[in-house]
């Protein structure tokens, strides 16, 4: 039932732009006067009962253009993809030649999106058609969830519980706000 199943328009990967580009630092914006005080959603730590660093979930970056029908984003965009299996961080193969994958005995854990964010995208269209403005859904961060017998998104169970949180919101990663940098995200990568 997750949004990944929603229709996703074609995208093209641009490897020559760098495999893991860093988003630009956040610029000043004029929204602060309406912001909730302490309005950021606190970071999600699904393993709070243990050492937070004990488990890891890989986040990969890709650069690509986003399309909507015949229209294509004016600039390539950078997106985050949750990848791989969850396990103790010390055993995840983050470097070439590093050992084997950790496989839990018992329930299976999967790296899936935790939070989402929006990015403005201006789409240029052929044939003199007017440009389009859209906001694309991006993965902001990943987390580990436990797979139950049923493997659809809605059945993924959290590691631990989350209490009520005041003022929804979190700046998941710095990004240019007023520059309106365009970003998009991969479907079915999880």
């Amino acid at each position: 039932q997750g949004w990944q199943a929603f229709k996703n328009d074609a995208t093209e990967i641009i490897p020559e732009l760098g495999e893991y580009p860093e988003p630009p630092p956040e610029l000043e914006n004029n929204k602060t006067m309406n912001r909730a005080e302490n309005g950021g959603r606190p970071p999600h730590h699904p393993f709070e009962t243990k050492d937070v660093s004990e488990y890891s979930c890989r986040e990969l970056h890709f650069t690509r253009y986003v399309t909507d029908g015949p229209c294509r984003s004016a600039k390539p965009v950078t997106e985050l993809v949750c990848s791989g299996q969850c396990g103790p961080a010390r055993l995840l193969p983050n470097a070439i030649g590093r050992g084997k994958w950790w496989r839990p005995s018992g329930p299976d854990f999967r790296c899936i999106p935790d939070r989402y964010r929006a990015q403005r995208v201006q789409l240029l269209c052929p044939g003199g058609e007017a440009p389009r403005a859209r906001k694309v859904r991006l993965v902001a961060s990943c987390k580990c969830k436990r797979l139950t017998r049923f493997h659809n998104q809605s059945e993924l169970k959290d590691f631990g519980t989350e209490a009520a949180r005041p003022q929804k919101g979190r700046k998941p990663r710095p990004r240019a706000r007023s520059a309106k940098a365009n970003q998009a995200e991969l479907e079915n990568a999880y």
Epitope: Y116, A118, R137, G169, R170
Partner: antibody, heavy 121, light 110 residues
Framework: EVQLVQSGAEVKKPGASVKVSCKVS????????IHWVRQAPGKGLEWMGG????????IYAQKFQGRVTMTEDTSTDTAYMELSSLRSEDTAVYYC??????????????WGQGTLVTVSS | QAVVTQEPSLTVSPGGTVTLTCGSS?????????PYWFQQKPGQAPRTLIS???DKHSWTPARFSGSLLGGKAALTLSGAQPEDEAEYYC?????????FGGGTKLTVLG
Amino acid sequence: EVQLVQSGAEVKKPGASVKVSCKVSGYTLSELSIHWVRQAPGKGLEWMGGFDPEDGETIYAQKFQGRVTMTEDTSTDTAYMELSSLRSEDTAVYYCATDSAGYWYKFFQHWGQGTLVTVSS
Amino acid sequence: QAVVTQEPSLTVSPGGTVTLTCGSSTGAVTIDHYPYWFQQKPGQAPRTLISDTDDKHSWTPARFSGSLLGGKAALTLSGAQPEDEAEYYCLLDYGGSFVFGGGTKLTVLG
């Protein structure tokens, strides 16, 4: 599909506070951007505030700044809107609305049934 | 805070065409205001017809279309039906802060 179910009607006295809930089903709250809109009897729609996924923050309409608090409980997928220092002109139907959790953000796609809040002494 | 203006009321004949507009006190409405259009009938919650200037939804009848027209957002109804009689609201995005227009009461004379 996203579905929103709101709490029942409330009658409050001036100066009191009201907390309206909005239960999300079909998706998890963390996948969605919840906004709150109100409509006084015979009047138009008025945006109160909501989650801006572009900046990852809750943003409130200036008119309600300091008087409204929007929170969430992700363990129950329920969003809340609390309005304090109520006055008679706050009598309205309060709606929660959310995006469709699609590839493109489209806000206000799904609406709760509305909660009538009556402020009367 | 910006003020969003709409025609208070408009009338159209069945089968006719009518255009509702949505202006901003801050200047011309552009695609970067991501204009939305909503339809609301008495006793019902609003429902979205158009998002992001011109993007229809699965439930939006084909006779509705969104555009920009002379510095305003526009909702055009071509081939009006009796069931289109309703209140129509536009909504503009001012960098994450939203403002509704005052609404247009559309009457379908029949």
